[in-house]
């Protein structure tokens, strides 16, 4: 997992039954916030499953790993982590499962060392385009973020404000061109129907991209050409029917890539011929022997690697759910 972890060092706690005599004094710079557990040795603060409604103001300056999971934060305002002096050491921030539905512009400003951010399992109905860049300048100061984990952040359908969720997320990834140093991006389980074109070209440092468990039907307008550092591409559990020649050539041209394609409803008709030929020759697809046809009915469960051109003819009728361009 790419969530921040810490050693099981001794944690001090500010739970009432562990309160020390100094708790009645004015807060000290490195005191542990109420309802949190702190380990200065591990540079870790955990405020987990405490139903917090806002980020504690009195976070210790030493914190490198901050867990704020399982809370009820609702809104992350601008400068939510801005402190005097700043939290200069904070490198890993986990906000997963904290019922966030709005992340405002500049929410993560004044965190100069923030390398890993996990916002997974929050119903983000309103993610500002400038949530990660902090400003609406054409070119913002580069973000220090290297890993951005955004799995299962799609809100319920009735909270999506009648707009494209894909577009909202991509705007936040691209605005200010601040995330050019991003190496890991996880966008699994977000009901993405499509990937906006050119988005990957604007994240040139990506090593790991996880788009698994979405509803992607096609990669026709997605270019992987510039992602020369890409090492893993997870496309499992989508709605992919076939990969066309342009996509196959781009993937083959990436020097370090491993692609994961399991559990897609591959349509084994005449359009699949190029992909089958490619699969037989390529080394980039992991578990390629597990890929099977879903349609047409007569081809169901046939292994793609075992098909030949005679098997791949075109019957015009597809099930309605797959009749998309």
């Amino acid at each position: 997992s790419s969530s921040p972890t810490s050693s099981a060092s001794s944690f001090s706690s500010s739970a009432p039954f562990l309160a020390s005599a100094v708790s009645a004094q004015p807060p000290l710079p490195d005191q542990c916030p109420a309802l949190c557990e702190c380990s200065e040795a591990a540079r870790t603060v955990k405020c987990v499953n405490r139903n917090l409604t806002e980020v504690p103001t009195d976070l210790p300056a030493y914190v490198r790993n901050l867990f704020l999971t399982g809370n009820q934060l609702a809104v992350l305002p601008a400068g939510a982590f801005a402190r005097r002096p700043p939290l200069a050491e904070l490198a890993a921030l986990n906000l997963s499962g904290s019922r966030l539905d709005e992340v405002r512009a500049g929410a993560f400003e004044h965190l100069p060392s923030l390398r890993q951010l996990d916002l997974s399992h929050n119903p983000l109905a309103d993610l500002s385009p400038f949530a990660f860049s902090g400003s609406n300048a054409s070119v913002s100061a580069p973000s220090p973020l290297v890993e951005l984990i955004l799995n299962h952040i799609v809100p319920p359908e009735d909270e999506r404000q009648n707009r494209s969720f894909e577009g909202m997320v991509v705007a936040a990834l691209l605005a200010g061109r601040a995330l050019q140093g991003l190496r890991r991006l996880e966008l699994a389980s977000n009901h993405f129907l499509y990937l906006p074109r050119d988005v990957l070209a604007q994240l040139p440092s990506l090593r790991h991209l996880d788009l698994s468990n979405n509803s992607l039907v096609s990669l026709t307008y997605v270019s992987f050409r510039n992602l020369t550092h890409l090492e893993s591409l997870h496309l499992e559990d989508n709605a992919l029917k076939v990969l066309h020649n342009g996509t196959l050539a781009e993937l083959q041209g990436l020097p370090h890539i491993r692609v994961f394609l399991d559990n897609n409803p591959w349509v084994c008709d005449c359009h699949m011929a190029d992909m089958v030929t490619w699969l037989k020759e390529t080394e980039v697809v992991q578990g390629k022997d597990r890929l099977t046809c879903a349609y047409p009915e007569k081809m169901r469960n046939r292994v793609l690697l075992e098909l030949n051109s005679a098997d791949l003819d075109c019957d015009p009728i597809l099930p309605p759910s797959l009749q998309t361009s």
Partner: antibody, heavy 123, light 107 residues
């Protein structure tokens, strides 16, 4: 004031190629996608493709793959479309049009247009 | 590709009348629809985007609306300068496609 100034009309022979230019002014050229749109005589509009001037990354409508190549010259804030293997079907007015700001993948409407370049393919 | 079906193809009306042009998308495009006006020999001009947001400088007699996958452009109290062709265009996912157009003529 935003302006898109296109090159003049072209008369070319079948099989030839042509390159049409679109010079942008009045805004930060690299911040907005530049689109190209075809309008055949008396017909509707067809989106050919767009290009991100910052990265040079182009997206073509599949229908125009192999027909149109989109490029930019950032130093002169100019976008180009090259059309090759021309036939009479390519005779049309070609427009450049400013599209979305680079980070907004859903604002793909065209708020400023060039005046259009008439291409006639005839022997 | 998403198909945009525009109707009517042509329409005659008098100055002062109210007209409505409709456009239907072949699938859900949320509110990602734009309307353009084009005069003979000129470039199209953006009137409406996001289904109902009016471009700056466009008169308030123009209005856009959405009901599911059907979109409408309404022009109240037609003025002489409103005559020309109108096109819808979805701006949801590539390739962006246009409706076939509606030619609005003076009766």
């Amino acid at each position: 004031e935003v302006q898109l100034q296109q090159s003049g009309p072209e008369l070319v022979k079948p099989g030839a190629s042509v390159k049409i230019s679109c010079k942008a002014s009045g805004y930060t050229f690299t911040d907005y996608y530049m689109n190209w749109v075809k309008q055949s005589h008396g017909k509707s509009l067809e989106w050919i493709g767009d290009i991100n001037p910052y990265s040079g990354g182009a997206t073509n409508n599949q229908k125009f793959k192999g027909k149109a190549t989109l490029t930019v010259d950032k130093s002169s804030s100019t976008a180009y479309i090259e059309l090759r293997s021309l036939t009479s079907e390519d005779s049309a007015v070609y427009f450049c049009a400013r599209g979305s700001i680079y980070y907004d993948s859903t604002a793909n409407y065209f708020d400023y247009w060039g005046q259009g370049t008439t291409l006639t393919v005839s022997s | 590709d998403i198909q945009m079906t525009q109707s009517p193809a042509s329409l005659s009306a008098s100055v002062g009348e109210t007209v409505t042009i409709t456009c239907r998308a072949s699938e859900n495009i949320y509110s990602y629809l734009a309307w353009y006006q084009q005069k003979q020999g000129k470039s199209p001009q953006l009137l409406v985007y996001n289904a109902k947001s009016l471009t700056e400088g466009v008169p308030s007699r123009f209005s856009g609306s959405r009901s599911g996958t059907q979109f409408s452009l309404k022009i109240n109290s037609l003025q002489p300068e409103d005559f020309g062709s109108y096109y819808c265009q979805h701006h949801y996912v590539t390739p962006w496609t246009f409706g076939g157009g509606t030619k609005l003529e003076i009766k």
